[in-house]
């Protein structure tokens, strides 16, 4: 008996095939010897079976001595042996209808579970194996699960179903819905504009939800929250933002937030949460700032750091093509007595410098001048 | 919904080989066949074959010795090849869904053939 | 090669008009005939198929009818979007071969 597997939802065709190279009578029946259909002439006929809307066959390749039973939006109960009758021969076909699903939903946040559930006919004994985006292979039975999904998890996971040495392949669309990036940060010299931007990993249509970002300064003892806002089909409107600091807000995605001024009070981590409607959860992207000055107060050339800064970075003061004369992992440092000239702090890592400010000091009968 | 998107070169000269592909996308490839059929500016429509996922096709005799349709199963994907071209085979090239009858075609690639 | 013979292959009608256009199969195709309806730069869209049946979506002033040899496509009430040109085909025998188009105008 020659089996086929088919897919819920698919059309698929059930072959027979005559020694005579030409149109004779023929008919497909289903295990209850039910009649679905046939020919009569060149007419398709129909029986009463539950298939009759679904069912079809091709008439051009009946002058082949090709009957196929064709049959279309394929149901799991659509699984089972159909017969072709022909030439006084009957052809026997199993056919084996499966289905594979995602949970609820094939967008799903990051950090939540994946699964999916395998409908097969009664009888049936059929393995799965999936595949990632990322090439990650899962195998399993009626369900599999992917438990803590991830940014990479996002693209088309395709899914095998084997039985009797056949198999079918599903392919699954599956989103994350993400923010681009988990963690950023934002160095800044005292004074200078700070733009934060929050990308999303992710395209639909409609984007409906809502958002708020908490801050927790360096200075302050406890978290603040400095906007809220909604998010209608992609458009942003605030619903309240603090007075200090004023940040303001694009209208479009990405999410853009602008803070006017990099202050010192202002330095820290911040937390910007959205919640997408009809979705369970929310999604995080932390922002950090690092706020720099530097400042010469009688004569002392002292610069600063305030904000989450890891303890690998290096804060230095030197003067402008010379060798640092000060350099220490810590946040603050200074110079006494500095000479004249252009002094530069810097915030650097492994060489690389992340924040610069210039200070200009003057010889000792002058005050100092901030470019 | 079902879709065609059809591609290939435009502009061939005589005696090169037309070469088209049609992806098909939101429906089921398996169960049915895939056609190509060609337009003549202002002429009637003319079958020139057909694939199934499987690899069997059908062509139409008048063409049959120039024709190649193959089928790429692992992309929903099926090509259309046309040798020798001559200013005759000038026409406007539609893949299309057949079981008996064309329910769904693509946009159409107008294919000219000139020196 | 079986020959589909459309008639009239052109046709002036105002809206509101009854049309009809006949195809002509020879030998005959029992019932296995469709109707295709093209606007210019466009593919054609599907309209009857196995010589009566409306394909979904579209409007019930479009009727087919015929068996063997004659078939008919019947527009009941010519609508400003029905100005195209339609052609039959049979799904018969290979090769799968079309009518050669009737253009229904405007009057």
């Known amino acids: 008996k020659k089996v086929v597997l088919g897919k819920k939802g698919d059309t698929v065709e059930l072959t027979c095939t005559a020694s005579q190279k030409k149109s004779i009578q023929f008919h497909w029946k289903n295990s209850n010897q039910i009649k679905i259909l046939g020919n009569q002439g060149s007419f398709l006929t129909k029986g009463p079976s539950k298939l009759n809307d679904r069912a079809d066959s091709r008439r051009s390749l009946w002058d082949q001595g090709n009957f196929p039973l064709i049959i279309k939006n394929l149901k799991i109960e659509d699984s089972d042996t159909y017969i072709c009758e022909v030439e006084d021969q009957k052809e026997e076909v199993q056919l084996l209808v499966f289905g594979l699903t995602a949970n609820s939903d094939t967008h799903l946040l990051q950090g939540q579970s994946l699964t999916l559930t395998l409908e097969s006919p009664p009888g049936s004994s059929p393995s799965v194996q999936c595949r990632s985006p990322r090439g990650k292979n899962i195998q399993g039975g009626k369900t599999l699960s992917v438990s803590q999904l991830e940014l990479q998890d996002s693209g088309t996971w395709t899914c095998t179903v084997l039985q009797n040495q056949k198999k079918v392949e599903f392919k699954i669309d599956i989103v994350v819905l993400a923010f681009q990036k988990a963690s950023s940060i934002v160095y800044k010299k005292e004074g200078e504009q700070v733009e934060f931007s929050f990308p999303l990993a992710f395209t639909v249509e409609k984007l409906t939800g809502s958002g708020e970002l908490w801050w927790q300064a360096e200075r302050a003892s406890s978290s603040k929250s400095w906007i809220t806002f909604d998010l209608k089909n992609k458009e942003v409107s605030v619903k309240r933002v603090t007075q200090d600091p004023k940040l303001q807000m694009g209208k479009k995605l990405p999410l853009h937030l602008t803070l006017p001024q990099a202050l010192p009070q202002y330095a820290g981590s911040g937390n910007l949460t959205l919640a997408l409607e009809a979705k369970t959860g929310k999604l995080h992207q932390e922002v950090n700032l690092v706020v720099m000055r530097a400042t010469q107060l009688q004569k002392n050339l002292t610069c600063e750091v305030w904000g989450p800064t890891s303890p690998k970075l290096m804060l230095s003061l030197k003067l402008e093509n010379k060798e640092a004369k000060v350099s220490k992992r810590e946040k603050a440092v200074w110079v006494l007595n500095p000479e004249a000239g252009m002094w530069q702090c810097l915030l650097s890592d492994s060489g690389q410098v992340l924040l610069e400010s210039n200070i200009k000091v003057l010889p000792t009968w002058s005050t100092p001048v901030q470019p | 919904q079902v879709q065609l998107q059809q591609w290939g070169a435009g502009l061939l000269k005589p005696s090169e080989t037309l070469s088209l592909t049609c992806a098909v996308s939101?429906?089921?490839?398996?169960?049915?066949?895939w056609s190509w059929i060609r337009q003549p500016p202002g002429k009637g429509l003319e079958w020139i074959g057909e694939?199934?996922?499987?690899?069997?096709?059908n062509c139409n005799p008048s063409l049959k010795s120039r024709v190649t349709i193959s089928v790429d199963t692992s992309k929903n994907q099926f090509s259309l090849k046309l040798s020798s071209v001559t200013a005759a085979d000038t026409a406007m090239y539609y893949c299309?869904?057949?079981?008996?009858?064309?329910?769904?075609w693509g946009q159409g690639t107008l294919v000219t053939v000139s020196s | 090669d079986i020959q589909m013979t459309q008639t009239p292959s052109s046709v002036s009608a105002s809206v509101g008009d009854r049309v009809t256009i006949t195809c002509r199969a020879s030998?005959?195709?029992?019932?296995?005939l469709a109707w295709y309806q093209q606007k210019p730069g466009k593919a054609p869209e599907l309209l009857i198929y196995?010589?009566?049946s409306l394909q979904s979506g579209v409007p019930s002033r479009f009727s087919g009818s015929g068996s063997g040899t004659d078939f008919t496509l019947t527009i009941s009430s010519l609508q400003p979007e029905d100005f195209a040109t339609y052609f039959c085909?049979?799904?018969?025998?290979?090769?799968?071969?079309f009518g050669g188009g009737t253009k229904v105008e405007s009057k």
């Open positions: 299309a869904r057949v079981l008996n009858f064309f329910d769904y």
């Open positions: 939101g429906g089921s490839f398996s169960g049915y066949y």
């Open positions: 694939i199934n996922h499987s690899g069997s096709t």
């Open positions: 030998p005959g195709i029992s019932n296995w």
């Open positions: 196995a010589a009566s």
């Open positions: 085909q049979q799904a018969n025998s290979f090769p799968l071969t």
